[in-house]
Amino acid sequence: KLLQVSTIAMQQQEKLIQQERALLNFTEWKRSCALQMKYCQAFMQNSLSSAHNSSPCPNNWIQNRESCYYVSEIWSIWHTSQENCLKEGSTLLQIESKEEMDFITGSLRKIKGSYDYWVGLSQDGHSGRWLWQDGSSPSPGLLPAERSQSANQVCGYVKSNSLLSSNCSTWKYFICEKYALRSSV
């Protein structure tokens, strides 16, 4: 009888673990959908604001070609950094080329010096592939140096003139990016 009760208890515990796992997966999926939704809204908001703003970039943002960049003065973990950018109608920095990387690192040298700045790069937990926030892969020359030994989720950041990786749950400055507004004149 005792063995029977023990077996039932173990089965119940196993069921509970499976339900917890399912709930965790659902929560992650929901968060991912919410972020994608915000991502689209950010670009919509950015496009619409062109009707009310003649300057290509907002105050305190730096312009380079078609992009505007904001270098934060606050520390956040990676996910919060992304949310902070979304609030500004932007996303975490997505580095498309060596030229853009050089511009960013050159600007950082002038502004702040050698600090850590989150960018919109994270490592897929299953495949281990590096992905930008829009789902694209970085070009081979823009892959983070494997510095993080973290068992947790790993995200990319810029320091000096390097792209590095770290546990996403550490606090760093961050860089936001959005399209510069085209002059209507």
């Epitope: 003065e73 606050i74 520390w75 956040s76 973990i77 919060t80 950094s81 902070n84 749950s169």
Partner: nanobody, 126 residues
């Protein structure tokens, strides 16, 4: 913009105590959470302790629980970190931090964003 000025750092023997202070200016101090971070050479920044705007809610890293106490004086616009039973592994630069506007998640200090001071060095020798 928030200005934060830390003081009270220094060198101390293992087992000793230090009290860090942080004077804040530039906005209404009593409306925001405050925190202490630390960073040792070659290590990631670590949230050591945090306190809600009212002082009613606090957070401590496991490594300092029972040894460190965070407190605040809203009348004086100051936050404190009392550090007792110091260990060599507590050696780091300690940064005072003020919650950024609009980042409030009640009770969850981890996901908030923070302005920070210049830092004060704490060295614990064995």
């Amino acid at each position: 913009q928030v200005q934060l000025q830390e003081s009270g750092g220094g060198s101390v023997q293992a087992g000793g105590s230090l009290r860090l202070s942080c004077a804040a200016s530039g906005r209404t101090f009593s409306s925001y959470a405050m925190a202490w971070f630390r960073q040792a050479p070659g290590m990631e920044r670590e949230l050591v302790a945090a306190i809600s705007w009212s002082g009613g809610s606090t957070y401590y890293a496991d490594s300092v629980k029972g040894r460190f106490t965070i407190s605040r004086d809203n009348a004086e616009n100051t936050v404190y970190l009392q550090m007792n039973s110091l260990k060599p592994e507590d050696t780091a630069v300690y940064y005072c931090a003020a919650e950024a506007e609009g980042s409030g998640r009640e009770g969850n200090f981890y996901e908030r964003s923070w302005y920070q001071g210049q830092g004060t060095q704490v060295t614990v020798s064995s």
